[in-house]
């Protein structure tokens, strides 16, 4: 008879212990359908007011031509500020010639003044050649004032209206880019 | 959920040439970026290459010349072609999707480079 209580016993602590797994799993698929339905409510925000506004650039995304450039308000190393694009859809700034130049380190001026921001640019350790994330060369008036003298790899940034050199795995903000849509009327 | 499929990993020797491709399906209506990233043995995970939904590319230094990443039209498929292959670059090559805070991964596919 005991022996039947504890077995009963033990069954119903079994049956306890998947219930509670499942409340845990549905909690946890709550909390994701959540976290999705924010997203998709952001995306369709974005999609709608774009729709609306006839706008080529997503909200606090500033355009120039057909670029927009989003200035980051964190601080991070360079390999995660290209993450950061990247989840956004863009990749770190690449400056294509002195007119874009012009136009970012005058918008930055407006914006926040004198800070450094990574841009999509690194040096190769073996050659020490400098290219743009998509392996293409800088334009010669485009090269990073050399200013590092770090063992470490090396990335550029944009201060002021230069361009310079640092180790990139120092702090700072970051500009991703992408393509402006193009209005379909 | 989003899944991704990779596929053509494999053993070749060194200067070789391999292509690795990935699919993704699921409930995907729009990735913001695809593309790929490798963890060699005893080594953190490292971006090798990736796309854009717009078409912008990026590709880690230690590959630039060398590797070079595409998308299919009108697919959510991409393809990396590995040329001049390096011992270096043996590891396990994972496929990524990324939209907004939601990071995808593959399973990951083994290339190693060796004679």
């Known amino acids: 008879k005991l022996l039947q209580v504890s077995t009963i016993a033990m069954q119903q602590q079994e049956k306890l212990i998947q219930q509670e797994r499942a409340l845990l799993n549905f909690t946890e698929w709550k909390r994701s359908c959540a976290l999705q339905m924010k997203y998709c409510q952001a995306f369709m925000q974005n999609s709608l007011s774009s729709a609306h506004n006839s706008s080529p650039c997503p909200n606090n995304w500033i355009q120039n031509r057909e670029s927009c450039y989003y200035v980051s308000e964190i601080w991070s190393i360079w390999h995660t500020s290209q993450e950061n694009c990247l989840k956004e859809g863009s990749t770190l700034l690449q400056i294509e010639s002195k007119e874009e130049m012009d136009f970012i380190t005058g918008s930055l001026r407006k914006i926040k003044g004198s800070y450094d921001y990574w841009v999509g640019l690194s040096q190769d350790g073996h050659s020490g050649r400098w290219l743009w994330q998509d392996g293409s060369s800088p334009s010669p008036g485009l090269l990073p004032a050399e200013r590092s003298q770090s063992a470490n790899q090396v990335c550029g940034y944009v201060k002021s209206n230069s361009l310079l050199s640092s180790n990139c795995s120092t702090w700072k903000y970051f500009i991703c880019e992408k393509y402006a849509l193009r209005s379909s009327v | 959920d989003v899944q991704l499929v990779e596929s053509g990993g494999g053993l070749v020797q060194p200067g070789g040439s391999l292509r690795l491709s990935c699919a993704a399906s699921g409930s995907i209506f729009s990735l913001n970026a695809m593309g790929w990233y490798r963890q060699a043995p005893g080594k953190e995970r490292e971006l090798v290459a990736h796309i854009t939904s717009d078409g912008r590319i990026v590709y880690a230094d230690p590959v630039k010349g060398r590797f070079t990443i595409s998308r299919v039209d009108g697919k959510n498929m991409v393809t990396l072609q590995m040329n001049s292959l390096k011992p270096e670059d043996t590891a396990v090559y994972y496929c990524?999707?990324?939209?907004?805070?939601?990071?995808?991964w593959g399973q990951g596919t083994q290339v190693t480079v060796s004679s």
């Open positions: 990524n999707a990324k939209h907004y805070a939601s990071n995808y």
